[in-house]
Interface confidence: low
């Protein structure tokens, strides 16, 4: 059978390295090799490229070498297929290396913000060496900021005779670091080169983005003033690399701004002692380019009745975030403050809050949060200047086996019954929601019985033991990833009742 | 059968030099990319440099760029790694790998896929670099 | 360069039950250039797995890979004494290649 005949013929011309052809044959039922049969410099010479039956043999592909690539010039090209039955030969193409030409990417060597021009970066590169010098390339220019997958694109031509190898791009985000690649083709080429290596630039810097500001309503003190601690962050969207050098905070109770008192700090956090009316707060930040928009915080009167609008709410895990989800009867309500922190014994060490718009759902991801803590989740509803009442759920990102088992101990020992009491393992210990307890009781050299009882009883009463008789005990605390053993407790029970 | 066979270990002192060989047998030896991996005594696997089947160097390891130098030589059926300069740290046995063009699954149209992967290895010269 | 995190470092499994051993790559690599290796006791190590999830010939098909961008898993449905060994992964996207830092696993 003669081989199938070679078709999809494709040819690229590497610009002073290497002229290739590859084509795609059907599935040869037995071995075939190939020949690639070529005319150049306008039909004046001919040479074949083969590949022949020992070691080259099935590879469609064949490419032709210096110093027998000459350009500009059009080529003829045929393939033939051979085996032991005979040759089959492709459909005569024809290749101008003008349109099939791929050069070297060119390099770009600063990526550079101009003076006094805000938003915009000025772009310098040398044109490949290896390049047709009369040709007029034309070029494209990735960009992305430093922490972004996404990729945006310009086009643009530079004649050879510019000699001016910059671009300027704009309309970009204030002092945010972009990385800048940049590609090129001679502009008759379907081929492009291959990416430049990626250089980084930032832009200027400019006054700060603006803030995003929050509270936390601590109980009023004796002396009826109200702690509260006020926290801010760089808005959503702020660039990256802003820096403020410090914050101005003014607060005055509502209605009466002649109250007004201020406080500079460099601090993201202060601590404010109110009375027990309405405040409104103000924060901003600054740097050396002047001041960010101002952020607004109202403090409820210690009186005042909060609305509540969140029913419920479901924390739930995928593979690598946490989902928090609520449902709320406020269709109106379309911003919600989340805080979440470490549900430790002693004061949490890390408290953290974030703004959610448009959605009942927020996310984290996993690696954000420690395995094995339980975190403390509150969601706030904010309808312009209020804050209604939180509504708040425990979650752990990983389960495991809590640290230490129960600590128990044998109360009210009876001749055939014993009460069994055991303390709440410490939360630093649990790794996880403890969804049950299961008492282990064995009489000496007898068989072991259980008894499996809820998370929230802390005691229990044993029953129908053997009189006089020596028994070892110990309790298991359980999450989902499984169980840990408390001490292990002996007992004796008596022979006969005391009153 | 197909057979990589290295040679060259040895005890030399930091600071010293050596040459590692790999003979192959049993397959068309230019057709195939080769690699050297080296393991450190009770540690896992760390790829030093390859070649590829145009003989072209597809690389070094951070640890070892600038000190050691891979090359082949197709008539031997022969692929060497030079190694100056060594070090304590590069106390391990060389592995010399073979990297073969394996296809993976049909992408499409009537185009075939093929990638280049260790698919053999030898079994390894200990190399000792102590004074 | 590239880093490549395998998770757990060891594992004991009994006979007959699955194992599943994670590799994370500090950055995306392409599902191409991704291979998974066994080293046995005393021996060289293995081709096992090429391009995620194309098993090498001569190899058992309890054997599967699956995984892609960063997170890449080495499964064995049903694992048998021979299996015991270090099992690798390494990528051949970018330069320098690198290998995972290894599982050891052991039969219970």
């Known amino acids: 059978v003669l081989p199938a005949k070679p078709e999809n013929i494709s040819c690229i011309f590497y610009y002073e390295e290497n002229f290739t052809c590859t084509w795609s044959p059907e599935k040869e039922a037995s071995y075939t090799w190939y020949k690639v049969k070529r005319t150049y410099s306008y039909g004046y010479k001919s040479d074949i490229c083969s590949t022949d039956n020992s070691t080259r043999g099935n590879h469609a592909s064949c490419s032709f070498l210096p110093p027998t690539i000459t350009n500009p010039d059009n080529y003829t090209i045929q393939v033939e297929a051979q085996n032991a039955d005979g040759i089959m030969k492709s459909d005569i193409t024809y290749w101008n290396l003008d349109a099939i030409m791929k050069i070297e990417p060119p390099e770009i060597f600063s990526v550079k913000s101009v003076l006094g021009i805000k938003r915009m970066l000025q772009i310098k590169w040398i044109r490949p060496v290896l390049a047709p010098h009369s040709s007029t390339l034309k070029y494209t220019l990735r960009f992305r900021t430093i922490n972004s997958a996404y990729w945006m694109e310009v086009n643009f031509t530079k004649e050879d005779i510019d000699r001016d190898e910059t671009y300027n791009l704009t309309e970009l985000q204030a002092f945010t670091e972009y990385v800048m690649t940049l590609r090129c083709a001679p502009a008759e080429s379907m081929f492009w080169s291959g990416w430049s290596q990626e250089k980084v630039g930032t832009t200027e810097e400019e006054a700060p983005y603006g803030l995003d500001l929050w509270r936390v309503l601590k109980p009023a003190m004796v002396d009826g003033r109200r702690p509260v601690q006020l926290m801010w962050k760089k808005a959503t969207g702020a660039p990256v690399l802003e820096k403020a050098l410090g914050y101005n905070i003014w607060y005055f109770p509502e209605n009466n701004t002649n109250l007004t008192e201020t406080v500079n700090t460099t601090n993201q956090t202060h601590e404010l002692y109110l009375g027990g009316k309405t405040y409104w707060v103000y924060v901003v930040s600054y740097n050396s380019l002047g001041e960010s928009p101002v952020a607004t915080l109202r403090i409820p009167a210690l009186n005042e009745k909060t609305f509540q609008c969140i029913e419920a709410m479901q924390a739930c895990l995928t593979q690598d975030q946490l989902v928090v989800e609520w449902q709320s009867s406020a269709p109106e309500v379309d911003t919600w403050m989340v805080e979440w922190f470490p549900d430790v014994d002693s004061e949490p060490s890390s408290f953290s809050w974030e703004s959610v718009s448009q959605a009942r759902n927020w996310t984290i991801q996993k690696d954000e949060l420690k395995p094995l803590w339980c975190y403390n989740i509150s969601v706030y509803p904010v309808l312009r200047d209020r804050v209604g009442q939180p509504y708040s759920t425990q979650a752990y990102v990983q389960e495991g086996i809590p640290s230490a088992g129960p600590v128990t101990q044998a109360d009210s020992i009876g001749v055939k019954t014993v009460t069994i009491t055991w303390k709440e393992i410490p939360k630093s210990k649990r790794n996880g929601f403890i969804k049950n307890y299961t008492i282990f009781y064995q009489a000496e050299d007898g068989k072991e019985f259980s008894k499996t009882v809820n998370s929230n009883i802390l005691q229990y009463r044993l029953e129908s033991l053997t009189r006089r008789t020596s028994y070892s005990l110990q309790v298991m605390a359980s999450t989902n990833a499984g169980g840990t053993n408390g001490t292990k407790i002996n007992f004796k029970t008596l022979s006969i009742s005391v009153l | 059968e197909v057979q990589l066979v290295e040679s060259g270990g040895d005890l030399v002192k930091p600071g010293g030099s050596l040459r590692l060989s790999c003979v192959a047998s049993?397959?068309?030896?230019?057709?195939?990319?080769m690699s050297w991996v080296r393991q450190a005594p009770g540690k896992g696997l760390q790829w030093v440099s390859g070649?590829?089947?145009?003989?072209?160097?597809?690389g070094y390891a951070d640890a070892v760029k600038g000190r050691f130098t891979i090359s082949r030589d197709n008539a031997r059926n022969t692929v060497y790694l030079q190694m100056n300069s060594l070090r304590a740290e590069d106390t391990a046995v060389y592995y010399c790998?073979?990297?073969?063009?394996?296809?993976?699954?049909?992408?499409?149209?009537?185009?075939?896929?093929?990638?280049?992967?260790?698919?053999?290895w030898g079994q390894g010269t200990l190399v000792t670099v102590s004074s | 360069e590239v880093v490549m995190i395998q998770t757990p470092l060891s594992l004991s499994v009994s006979p007959g039950e699955p194992a599943s051993i994670s590799c994370r790559a500090s950055?995306?690599?392409?599902?191409?250039?991704l291979v998974w290796y066994l080293q046995k006791p005393g021996q060289s190590p293995q081709l096992l797995i090429y391009?995620?999830?194309s098993r090498a010939t001569g190899v058992s098909d309890r054997f599967s890979g699956s995984g892609s961008g960063t997170d890449f898993t080495l499964r064995i449905s049903r694992v048998e004494a021979e299996d015991v060994g270090v099992y690798y992964c390494?990528?051949?996207?970018?330069?320098?290649?690198?290998f995972g830092q290894g599982t050891k696993v052991e039969i219970k």
């Open positions: 070649i590829n089947w145009a003989g072209g160097t597809i």
């Open positions: 790998a073979r990297e073969s063009p394996l296809r993976l699954g049909d992408l499409g149209g009537d185009y075939f896929y093929y990638y280049y992967y260790i698919d053999v």
């Open positions: 390494q990528q051949y996207d970018q330069s320098p290649r690198t």
């Open positions: 049993g397959f068309t030896f230019d057709d195939y990319g």
């Open positions: 950055q995306s690599v392409s599902s191409r250039y």
């Open positions: 391009g995620t999830s």
